[in-house]
């Protein structure tokens, strides 16, 4: 299994972060990150702008090791986690994702990966076995995407350019590619 410890630049340890370049269509109930609290848009923070560029979202740096079975990268890799809800840049709270900025049937702004960078990683194996290098794709920047509450949730699945995403198998975790488990998790994933 993976080395599931991730560190951001504030040295906060958060186990089992979700994947970014090609997310599964189902998110597990027990691994929600930086979850936005439920609640309506605060009435004293009106925002009716249609310009997504006026919105911003959190980019947290996380460091982790790349693993392939018992083999692990010689050095950790660092990538961004696109965190929390989007809000007007001037009003974005310090607390990560503490405010949901959408009104029930109004626009919804999602903080999602925007650009990726590829990195070649050399793995080291116990016992001196020589593994091959691997290429990984890491989130390089985040963006706000404007959705409406009634948009097809598939928009949230297309974080990366790929369409040939695997589906998560039938382990203890929820099965299948199809529509991945519960929508509340999906809505709060970024």
């Amino acid at each position: 299994q993976g080395w599931q410890a991730f560190k951001n630049d504030a040295t906060e340890i958060i186990p089992g972060l979700r994947e970014y370049p090609e997310p599964p269509q189902e998110l597990e109930n027990n691994q929600t990150m930086n979850r936005a609290e439920n609640g309506g848009r605060p009435p004293h923070h009106p925002y009716d702008t249609k310009d997504v560029s006026e919105y911003s979202c959190r980019e947290l740096h996380y460091t982790r090791f790349v693993t392939d079975g018992p083999c692990r990268s010689a050095k950790p890799v660092t990538e961004l986690v696109c965190s929390g809800q989007c809000g007007p840049a001037r009003l974005l709270p310090n607390a990560i994702g503490r405010v949901k900025w959408w009104r029930p049937n109004g626009p919804d702004f999602r903080c999602i990966p925007d650009r990726y960078r590829a990195q070649r990683v050399q793995l080291l194996c116990p016992g001196g076995a020589a593994p091959r290098s691997r290429k990984v794709r890491l989130v390089a920047s985040c963006k706000c995407k404007r959705l409406t509450r009634f948009h097809n949730q598939s928009e949230l699945k297309d974080f990366g350019p790929e369409t040939a995403r695997p589906q998560k198998g039938r382990k203890p975790r929820p099965r299948a590619r199809g529509a991945k488990a519960n929508q509340a998790e999906l809505e709060n994933a970024y």
């Epitope: 994947e19 392939d68 079975g69 083999c71 076995a129 290429k135 040939a164 995403r165 695997p166």
Partner: antibody, heavy 124, light 106 residues
């Protein structure tokens, strides 16, 4: 649609040279390893080698080392497989494949996108 | 080189029957990946990392195993499942495929 599109079928004579191509569509090949796989008529799959188009670094299976050359042009997102002197035994279907990557707290790699294949026939 | 040996070479079964395909590695590998190939088509990913179901693959397919012995199971064969199946290891160079198992209609 994410896909790999390969060049068309080739009919060549022994001793001739050949270069076949594999173009990435809707993704940049420099972000992935691109592999070449041979399938001789009625036989199984054989891995030939791989390239990292970002810097051109290649790896070959021992049996194909020195027999073929793998290259790429990242500016047009295309990988190539070439022969300087074909033999009748090079008659086969050649596939390119992308080594995809996925992460969910654990790292995964697999050949997720395959080209449609290029048939190479070498006959006098 | 890690040699992957698939057995049986041919499996003759009827629709609705259970198919069990084996892949044995000459030395321990972390994961095995399975591909399906139909005549005139490119291979397609079926199972990755030993037991993970790839996109669009029906739940009747499953994978298991560890170390040197791995299995692909098709719980109830459908007409479209008759094809050739290959296992593959990606962890060590040179990358290798098994020789394939042909699942044919009895």
């Amino acid at each position: 649609e994410v896909q790999l599109v390969q060049s068309g079928a080739e009919v060549k004579k022994p001793g001739e040279s050949l270069k076949i191509s594999c173009k990435g569509s809707d993704f940049e090949i420099k972000d992935y390893y691109i592999h070449w796989v041979r399938q001789m008529p009625g036989k199984g799959l054989e891995w030939m080698g791989q390239i990292d188009a970002e810097d051109g670094e290649t790896e070959y299976a021992p049996r194909f080392q020195g027999q073929v050359t793998i290259s790429a042009d990242k500016s047009i997102s295309t990988a190539y497989l070439q022969w300087s002197s074909l033999k009748a035994s090079d008659t086969a279907m050649y596939y390119c494949a992308r080594e995809g990557y996925y992460y969910d707290g654990r790292d995964y790699w697999y050949f997720d996108v395959w080209g449609q294949g290029t048939t190479v026939t070498v006959s006098s | 080189e890690i040699v992957l040996t698939q057995s049986p070479a041919t499996l003759s079964l009827s629709p609705g029957e259970r198919a069990t395909l084996s892949c044995s590695a000459s030395s321990s590998v972390s994961y095995i990946h399975w591909y399906q190939q139909k005549p005139g088509q490119a291979p397609r990913l079926l199972i990755y990392s030993t037991s993970e179901l790839a996109s669009g693959i029906p739940a009747r397919f499953s994978g298991s195993g560890s170390g040197t012995d791995f299995t692909l199971t098709i719980s109830s064969l459908e007409p479209e499942d008759f094809a050739v199946y290959y296992c593959q290891q990606l962890s060590h160079l040179p990358l290798t495929f098994g020789g394939g198992t042909k699942v044919e209609i009895k």
